[in-house]
Interface confidence: medium
């Protein structure tokens, strides 16, 4: 070896200076007597080497690199050899940082493997080989006094976690645990954890299961679910509390939490849910009352709540066929008694013959809001129920009785807007229990089957706003019937429009007779049109050649009119305006000429 490098330190803080010397022995006879020593860091020549001959004839060059900014580089000592640079010796230099204090040390006890897994964040890159060691000792109390050390746990390269196996764990006392980081520039230690491995148990959630229905057990109530859960066996001896969360599968509802719940539940009934709704449920547990970590949420269980029997009031109304009074058309409307009144699957009308205990005869079963059936001759009353898979609503009795109550008076109707009509009346004496209001298209489109109806439960009401099935320009027949305890009063009816249309055209004017100063006109009235209000009056207009206008108002029953005070041998333009409350329309213009003074009158 002709040359040898020595350095002040092969590993330094990044950015620190480093000093190196290179000595070339005298016996390297093939070299120049006064060789010039060069320095190279990586591929770059470094100026600043101070060279001297020592007393023993060797050559020495010393260089100081003021800042080593490479995390790893080779420093070479070289000589010029012919046209090339000859490397006599080289050393590897490394620069970096001492290890930062490892932070966020945390541990979890895995009960399945009975091992303690600890993890930490190693901190910023040191650029140097750095070893981490998980160190621990056993201790009673709060780890102020250190007992025997536990075997060090060394993670695999590059990992920031380590697993202390069961054989090195102490399940019956505390452990002090910390991480030590070490490299060539120093050592650092994390803050110490003092823990009982059981305080950091990672629990697994129980398994949710639906209850197997047993024949003797009552089915769950509407809006309830029966379920149970099987605890995770390795955690059975740990005191825990659990919580359940649930939400409807459909819609945007957020999770609702229920708890605390016991770890073991042979049976649990969750109520207050929406009936007939599919729910997703999950459970999780935490060590309690002592410190711990929540388990993950369990896999979902999907269950459907039972539905509730309909809780509705059924408002009913009926009508007999005029040609066959035993054929009854029954109408009804469900009125919810609660916010969630249950799904209605259908309706049943039935009759219980007197003297036949328990025998119930169905008269009709339908999903519609009406049905027509033949009423048995001895039947005065039928029962109506709404039903679904959970049961039936309370039966609504429908009594078929004669109209024996007093009638209401002064029935009238008026438009509120194009889509509603107000019907008013004077209540009879005594007050009825309520009223049935029916409405539908009046003649010529009237039809009993297409009527809309409503029950007014307030017997003191003096009117009702019809908002359903009202369209403008249609004539409506409105029928109001008072209802009494066991009978009803006679029905009254009235006709009305919610909005009427102006006449579509006025009658054509015809000239019947004409003279020198008069003209007799006539017209045929337009037949009444559905949706158009009756005419209130006509106005006849006439204009002379000098553009002077004259008019006269005629009543709606007029069929003709005589214009007087005309000028002989003069031209007149005449038209008729037909007016109703909804507007007016003009006829076409009739032009005529009065006779000359010497002409004879035309009849």
């Amino acid at each position: 070896e002709c040359g040898h490098i020595s350095v002040s330190a092969p590993i330094v803080h990044l950015g620190d200076p480093i000093t190196a010397s290179c000595i070339i022995k005298q016996n390297c006879s093939h070299l120049d007597p006064e060789p010039q020593i060069l320095w190279r860091l990586g591929a770059e020549l470094q100026p600043g080497g101070r060279q001297q001959r020592l007393s023993d004839g060797t050559q020495e060059s010393i260089i100081t690199l003021p800042h080593l900014n490479h995390t790893q580089a080779f420093l070479s000592c070289c000589l010029n050899w012919g046209n090339s640079l000859q490397i006599l010796d080289q050393v590897e230099l490394r620069a970096g940082y001492p290890p930062a204090i490892p932070h966020n040390l945390s541990c979890l006890m895995n009960l399945t493997t009975s091992s303690l897994i600890c993890q930490w964040e190693p901190g910023p890159e040191t650029h140097l080989p750095t070893s981490f060691t998980l160190k621990s000792f056993k201790s009673r109390g709060n780890c102020q006094t250190q007992g025997d050390s536990i075997l060090d746990c060394v993670p695999k390269d590059g990992q920031s976690h380590c697993c202390i196996p069961r054989k090195h764990l102490l399940l019956y006392q505390n452990m002090g645990i910390w991480v030590q980081a070490e490299n060539a520039l120093g050592t650092s230690m994390s803050p110490q954890l003092c823990l009982d491995p059981m305080d950091v148990v990672k629990l697994e959630p129980p398994m949710l299961r639906t209850m197997d229905p047993s024949p003797e057990a009552a089915p769950p109530q509407a809006g309830c679910l029966q379920l149970c859960w099987e605890p995770w066996q390795p955690g059975l001896h740990i005191n825990q509390k659990c919580e359940l969360r649930h939400k409807p599968q459909r819609g945007e509802a957020s999770w609702a939490l229920v708890g605390p719940l016991p770890l073991e539940a042979l049976q649990y009934e969750l109520c207050g849910l929406l009936p007939a709704t599919a729910y997703t449920l999950q459970i999780r547990c935490i060590r309690w009352p002592l410190p711990g970590h929540w388990s993950d949420w369990s896999p979902s269980l999907e269950l459907r709540t039972t539905e509730r029997a309909p809780t509705v009031r059924l408002d009913t109304w009926w009508r007999q066929r005029q040609l066959d009074p035993r054929t009854v058309q029954l109408f009804w409307k469900p009125v919810p008694l609660e916010e969630d009144s249950g799904r209605i699957q259908g309706y049943v009308v039935s009759w219980r013959p007197s003297g036949q205990a328990g025998a119930i005869l169905p008269l009709c079963n339908t999903t519609e809001l009406s049905c027509t059936f033949h009423l048995p001759s001895e039947a005065q009353e039928v029962a109506l129920v709404a039903y679904n898979s959970a049961g039936t609503s309370r039966p609504t009795p429908v009594v078929f009785s004669e109209s024996r109550g007093p009638a209401l008076t002064r029935l009238h109707a008026m438009a509120r807007d194009p889509h509603s009509l107000w019907v008013g009346w004077e209540p009879p004496n005594p007050w009825p229990q309520g009223y049935v209001i029916e409405w539908g298209l009046g003649p010529p489109s009237a039809s009993n089957s297409n009527k809309t109806w409503r029950m007014e439960q307030n017997g003191r009401a003096t009117g009702f706003l019809l908002k359903e099935n009202i369209r403008p320009f249609q004539l409506y027949e409105i029928i109001v019937t008072p209802l009494y305890q066991d009978t009803m009063g006679p029905s009254q009816h009235v006709y009305a429009y919610s909005q009427e249309m102006a006449p579509s055209h006025a009658p054509e004017l015809h000239l019947k007779h004409i003279g020198k100063t008069w003209a007799q006109l006539e017209w045929v009235p337009e037949p009444p049109e559905l949706g158009k209000s009756p005419l209130t009056h006509y106005t006849i207009f006439w204009t002379n050649a000098q553009n002077q206008s004259f008019s006269a108002i005629l009543n709606a029953s007029s069929r003709g009119f005589v214009l007087h005070g005309l000028e002989p041998a003069s031209l007149y333009h005449i038209h008729l305006m037909a007016a109703s409350q909804a507007g007016a329309t003009n006829s076409t213009v009739l032009t005529l000429m009065t006779l000359t003074p010497e002409g004879s009158e035309l009849h």
Epitope: K138, R166, K167, L170, L171, Y172, Q173, M198, H237
Partner: antibody, heavy 118, light 107 residues
């Protein structure tokens, strides 16, 4: 000197309840696991239940799970065993036990006899 | 749960004999095995913990060995006060079952 003194044993009818107590002295009670071990007449030792120093871990033998409850009051240096739904096979001498750091039973009480009979 | 099986259930021996009792765990328990001695009408007493560690005050003629599933309690020279029932117990998991016991009687 460590002392463990059990009390609360006696005669009880099947289906009845009993509460055993163990008063501890001579050591820092709150730092140690404690437990109960029983021995039926003429039979071997049977571990019943243990409780961690803080009270949060309470394993039970399958034969008593759901019927017996172990608890402790560190402020009173006392260990308890609440026994419900007692059966004839629960008849035994019940020992209070102090556990060591490796789960071994370092100290034993003198025992209290529980007899379940109609 | 781990089961502990002791054998023999009883043995007869004379003073001065070497006595060996075995205990087998139904699964590996490392060295977490403890031995107890019980005399009639008395509470048990800890002899050996963690397979081979002699409890303070216990004569050195008692020794323990083994790890994993098979363990042995040896009394090198039986003394009159050693006639008693001996129990093994595991403490690897939180359930702490005992073996069925071995009664050592005078021959």
């Amino acid at each position: 000197e460590v002392q463990l003194l059990e009390s609360g044993g006696g005669l009880v009818q099947p289906g009845g309840s009993l509460r055993l107590s163990c008063a501890a002295s001579g050591f820092t009670f709150s730092l140690y696991w404690m437990g109960w071990v029983r021995q039926a007449p003429g039979k071997g030792l049977e571990w019943v239940s243990s409780i961690s120093s803080s009270g949060g871990v309470t394993p039970y033998a399958d034969s008593v799970k759901g019927r017996f409850t172990i608890s402790r009051d560190n402020s009173k240096n006392t260990l308890y065993l609440q026994m419900n739904s007692l059966r004839a096979e629960d008849t035994a001498v019940y020992y209070c036990a102090k556990l060591g750091e490796l789960g071994e039973i370092r100290e034993w009480g003198q025992g209290t006899l529980v007899t379940v009979s109609s | 749960d781990i089961q502990m099986t002791q054998s023999p259930s009883s043995l007869s021996a004379s003073v001065g004999d070497r006595v060996t009792i075995t205990c087998r765990a139904s699964q590996g328990i490392s060295s977490y095995l403890n031995w107890y001695q019980q005399k009639p009408g008395k509470a048990p007493k800890l002899l050996i913990y963690y397979a081979s560690n002699l409890q303070n005050g216990v004569p050195s003629r008692f020794s323990g060995s083994g790890s994993g599933t098979d363990f042995t309690l040896t009394i090198s020279s039986l003394q009159p006060e050693d006639f008693a029932t001996y129990y093994c117990q595991q403490s690897w998991v939180y359930h702490l079952p005992f073996g069925g016991g071995t009664k050592v009687e005078i021959k």
